[in-house]
């Protein structure tokens, strides 16, 4: 922390301007009034403060607003946002998308994923739900940021908004997030025709249950291997060789390369070797011919 000193009369600050770049840290601490700083935050980003000087300005704001900054200050943080921790951001209440845009622009090119994720979370909380305007802002200014939201926050996305989500926005989504988004996407695209539906639903399929994957296998979709590899293991394991063949179409030839990777490896272990051989790829590891498969889990459930 900066030690307290009194401000020399000639250094007294009446407005935030470029002259402050010549102030030492302790002079800034002593001479800049926090309320003045907050009122003139819109000027701060235009002044080439050092990171050390920004630390002092942040300290001033923290003292003035121990419960979290008001949005009027947050909107104009500019490069001061780079000094914020997720803990600082958690105290904020942000509702304006202009504020979100401004801070997303500042964070670009900096390692701030935790801060950005917290900021987006605060925006969703502040606005009450993840509405279309928020999704549009995220996809435009922060591709991939949608996946930084928790499954709980994503559950506030209305299905009508799903159409605004692009495939690349889902690249970093984990299984739990796709579990939340998939049923919404299914609902949003339910009135589309087969091929159009598949194109739209494809990025969300990492959250699809077995029944839906089986249904797709009956629709001549020719699922590409990258999409197949992103399906839930639990959704893939119950599929038969014939269903996988129909689901992938010509893409089934790519299974050979993925033979050792999940979910293909786990799926192979559950198939009869005879059936795997029909794929013509030399896939190995299936259940040998003549072996009887006992599903003990069924017996346990009955007893």
């Amino acid at each position: 922390d900066v030690e307290r000193t009194t401000c020399p009369p000639e250094k007294e600050v009446h407005e935030i301007d470029e002259s402050l770049i010549f102030y030492k840290k302790r002079e800034l601490e002593a001479c800049v009034d926090a309320a003045l700083l907050a009122a003139q935050m819109d000027r701060v980003d235009a002044i080439p403060f050092t990171y050390e000087q920004l630390d002092v300005l942040k300290h001033k704001l923290d003292e003035l607003y121990p419960q979290g900054y008001p949005e009027s200050v947050i909107r104009h943080l500019g490069h001061l946002f780079l000094k914020m921790s997720p803990e600082d951001i958690r105290k904020w209440n942000v509702t304006s998308l202009e504020t979100l845009k401004a801070l997303l622009k500042v964070s670009k090119g900096h390692e701030m994923s935790a801060q950005v994720a917290t900021l987006i979370d605060r925006v969703v909380v502040g606005r009450g739900q993840l509405d279309k305007d928020t999704v549009d802002t995220l996809t435009a200014f922060c591709p991939g940021c949608l996946c930084s939201l928790s499954p709980e926050r994503l559950s506030s996305v209305p299905p009508s908004v799903i159409g605004a989500v692009r495939p690349q926005d889902l690249d970093t989504c984990g299984p739990r997030q796709l579990d939340v988004l998939y049923p919404k996407a299914r609902l949003a695209f339910q009135n589309m025709s087969g091929s159009e539906y598949f194109v739209k639903i494809r990025p969300f399929l990492g959250g699809a249950p077995t029944e839906d994957v089986k249904a797709l296998s009956q629709q001549n979709v020719s699922m590409d291997l990258a999409t197949f590899m992103k399906l839930r293991r639990e959704a893939v394991l119950p599929l038969t060789v014939a269903e996988v063949q129909k689901l992938l179409g010509p893409h089934v030839e790519g299974l050979k390369v993925e033979e050792q990777h999940s979910p293909v490896r786990d799926w192979i272990l559950k198939q009869r070797q005879d059936d795997l051989d029909t794929l013509g790829l030399g896939l190995q590891g299936g259940i040998p011919n003549g072996y009887l498969i006992l599903d003990l889990s069924v017996r346990e459930a009955l007893s």
């Epitope: 050979k256 051989d277 794929l279």
Partner: antibody
């Protein structure tokens, strides 16, 4: 070693059909799909389609769907391509090729010598 | 389908020199490109796969590079036996596609 043997030439009349063969040896025939490629005189290579030799399931380049029919005979480790309603446009060298599944969908590491098909009356 | 645009369609170079051929894919092919040498009366010969991986037995005069949609193939220290037509092949999609070919001649 791996070999794909194709007859050198075929001469057929317009409107007729022809069945080109590709006999594989040196590897397990049913472990690799067989692909067919066309090259017209003075032109580039064009992928026609492929076939799963284990279940006989073919996939075609849309341009050749009504022209080519791919089949296999597992007992003789031979792949066939029948070309129907032949015209001068079908005069070309036809290659069979075997993929190596090293990455993605596999690149072709073994090729036949090609069969030169001439369609002429 | 993925289109592969290969250029130039023909080129002439001196013995000992270097030539470069390019292939542009109509979409990202994730480095899944192979390069072939083709001489009359023979099947194409695989030189390079996965953008830059040299096949066993292929001299290091042959090299490949690229990512995304743009790829290149080079031959340095040109030798008389390099006279051939060269093709790129994308195998990022099961429906494979070739470039139009580049005919290499020696000056």
């Amino acid at each position: 070693q791996v070999q794909l043997q194709q007859p050198g030439t075929e001469l057929v009349k317009p409107g007729a059909s022809v069945k080109l063969s590709c006999k594989a040896s040196g590897y397990t025939f049913t472990n690799y799909w067989m692909h067919w490629v066309k090259q017209r005189p003075g032109q580039g290579l064009e992928w026609i389609g492929n076939i799963n030799p284990s279940n006989g399931g073919p996939y075609y380049n849309e341009r050749f769907r009504s022209k080519a029919t791919l089949t296999v005979d597992k007992s003789s480790s031979t792949a066939y391509m029948q070309l129907s309603s032949l015209t001068s446009e079908d005069s070309a060298v036809y290659y069979c090729a075997r993929p190596y599944y090293g990455s993605s969908y596999g690149y072709f590491d073994y090729w036949g010598q090609g069969t030169t098909l001439t369609v002429s009356s | 389908d993925i289109q592969m645009t290969q250029s130039p369609s023909s080129l002439s170079a001196s013995l000992g020199g270097k030539v470069t051929i390019t292939c542009k894919a109509s979409q990202d092919i994730n480095k899944y490109i192979a390069w072939y040498q083709h001489k009359p009366g023979k099947g194409p010969r695989l030189l390079i796969h996965y953008t830059s991986e040299l096949q066993p037995g292929i001299p290091s005069r042959f090299s490949g590079n690229g990512s995304g949609r743009d790829y290149s193939f080079s031959i340095s220290n040109l030798e008389p036996e390099d006279i051939a037509t060269y093709y790129c092949l994308q195998y990022a999609n099961p429906l494979r596609t070739f470039g139009g070919g580049t005919k290499l001649e020696i000056k």
